[in-house]
């Protein structure tokens, strides 16, 4: 009961943890304007994998998106690949695992067969998760060190009077994000391996005992009982998250409480 | 169509203080960003303050700040600004206007004239 | 607070010339998000309230008759009226709408010979 509970618990964190992965590289907000000890703009920053925002105070919101693919940072590529990569692993654990789960039965599928599922799942998970976790990390330190370089020369002259303030860019939300869905589905896969152990077949330590009766013989060799329903699960690939990606590039937001900062 | 109705022109006295309407329509009242703008006689125009409707968040310009109160109605649909402690300073002609994309104003009021006088 | 210098303060010119007035910011308006420059151009007839003529520094709001032309980014913009008409007699403002406080620049009166 023990074992269904850790992997039915591993398969779920798992899942919001891949859905998590999978609305952080869609989110706009990996980077968001920094407002602190800046003068005050009517206009406001924010940058994805994907495309950057500006929010104007007006509630008009334009995005752009990085047409290019050789003019982007090497580091913005790699933290897409890295998200990616994460999310592909993400659903296979996902696909695997319901088979694996202890609570569904498929034919005769022998407990060895599902405790190695359980493995191979719970592998792919804590994979996406370190994919997931490396990914907004590099992506933060990135920001971080921009962050102090913009600062260094906040201030740039041209020509003496003139002023150009440079935006700055702190963590956005979908950091965040990024950071727990990582969490949840290393989390999730670290549960999956813990089950495994407990679905994998006990060895028992006692060797088969040969009672020879006069006439004819037979071995009685102790095993465990196996019992199927026999009944196929109908298990539908269920979409997890829907980026929810807008066709249009301009949007008219309405002003909210946050326009004004 | 966009329009931007104020209030009538204002003779106040000095030290008192002056609401100022202004009631737009032919849009959605909250979706909008009001802004207020000053223009003494023969002078240039001056930013005073906006309005979220929507919200009732308002932003200042630091020089009219303890001069104006920017507010808005949702029932009645309708933005004011107060003037306090008026001067003969405060003589000027008050626009409200639309804030739409690119943070610029396309529709305006036809301007509110108030004169301080004793 | 930025400063809109604009000049020159008036000018004077025959109906169907080119004009040209230039408005000068204390601090760049260019907005590197979106590559866009956050300036707006205003005329104002006698009389009347300001009316709204280019935004983004280059954008023609609608209704605005295509003689009218913005150009310059950063600090410098200009604004050319490719054949004047009579009924462009007005003052013309260029306005910061990038910084808080958002401000205007004194104007530029354009007058018909």
């Known amino acids: 009961m023990a074992v269904t509970a850790c992997q039915g618990l591993g398969f779920v964190v798992s899942l919001i943890g891949i859905a998590g992965i999978i609305a952080a590289t869609c989110m706009d907000q990996w980077s968001t304007q920094d407002l602190y000890n800046n003068p005050v703009t009517a206009v406001f920053n924010y940058q994805g994998l994907w495309r950057s925002c500006v929010r104007e105070s007006s509630g008009f919101t334009e995005c752009r998106g990085y047409f290019t693919l050789l003019g982007l940072p090497a580091m913005l590529q790699a933290v897409r690949a890295l998200m990616i990569v994460g999310i592909v692993l993400g659903a296979i654990g996902l696909l695997v695992s319901i088979f694996a789960l202890k609570c569904i039965r498929i034919g005769s599928m022998e407990d060895s067969a599902k405790a190695n599922m359980t493995l191979t799942s719970g592998i792919m998970f804590i994979v996406s998760g370190l994919c997931a976790i490396a990914g907004v990390s590099v992506f933060a330190n990135m920001l971080v060190t921009n962050f102090w370089m913009s600062t260094a020369n906040m201030y740039t002259g041209m020509g003496g009077m003139v002023q150009t303030v440079q935006t700055r860019y702190t963590f956005g939300a979908a950091l965040f994000v990024g950071w727990v869905a990582g969490g949840l589905t290393l989390i999730g896969g670290v549960m999956m391996c813990i089950a495994c152990r407990g679905l994998a077949p006990e060895e028992t330590n006692y060797k088969a005992v040969s009672y020879h009766a006069s006439g004819h013989s037979v071995a009685y060799k102790p095993g465990g009982f196996k019992a199927s329903t026999g009944f196929g699960s109908n298990t539908k690939n269920k979409k997890i998250y829907d980026g929810g990606a807008r066709t249009e590039d301009e949007v008219q937001s309405y002003p909210s409480k946050h326009d004004y900062v | 169509e966009v329009q931007l109705q104020q209030s009538g022109r204002e003779v106040v006295r000095p030290g008192t203080s002056v609401k100022v309407s202004c009631k737009p329509s032919g849009y959605a009242f909250t979706n909008y960003l009001i802004d207020w703008v000053k223009q003494r006689p023969g002078q240039g125009l001056e930013w005073i303050g906006g309005i979220n409707p929507g919200s009732g968040d308002t932003v200042y310009n630091e020089k009219f700040k303890a001069k104006a109160t920017l507010t808005a109605d949702k029932s009645s649909m309708t933005t004011n600004m107060q003037l306090s402690s008026l001067t003969s300073d405060d003589s000027a002609v008050y626009f409200c206007a639309r804030r739409v994309r690119g943070n610029s104003f396309d529709s305006w009021g036809q301007g509110t004239l108030v004169t301080v006088s004793a | 607070d930025i400063v809109m210098t604009q000049s020159p303060s008036s000018l004077t010119v025959r109906a169907g010339e080119k004009v040209t007035m230039t408005c000068k910011s204390s601090?760049?308006?260019?907005?590197?998000?979106?590559?866009?420059?956050?300036l707006t151009w205003y005329q104002q007839k006698p009389g009347q309230p300001p009316k709204l003529l280019l935004y983004?520094?280059?954008a023609r709001e609608s209704g605005v008759p295509d003689r009218f032309t913005g150009s310059g980014s950063g600090t410098d913009f200009t604004l050319s009226i490719s054949s004047v008409q009579a009924e462009d007699l007005a003052v013309y403002y260029c306005q910061n709408v990038y910084f808080y406080p958002l401000t205007f620049g004194a104007g530029t009166k354009l007058e018909i010979k």
């Open positions: 601090q760049s308006l260019f907005n590197s998000g979106n590559q866009r420059n956050y």
């Open positions: 983004w520094a280059t």
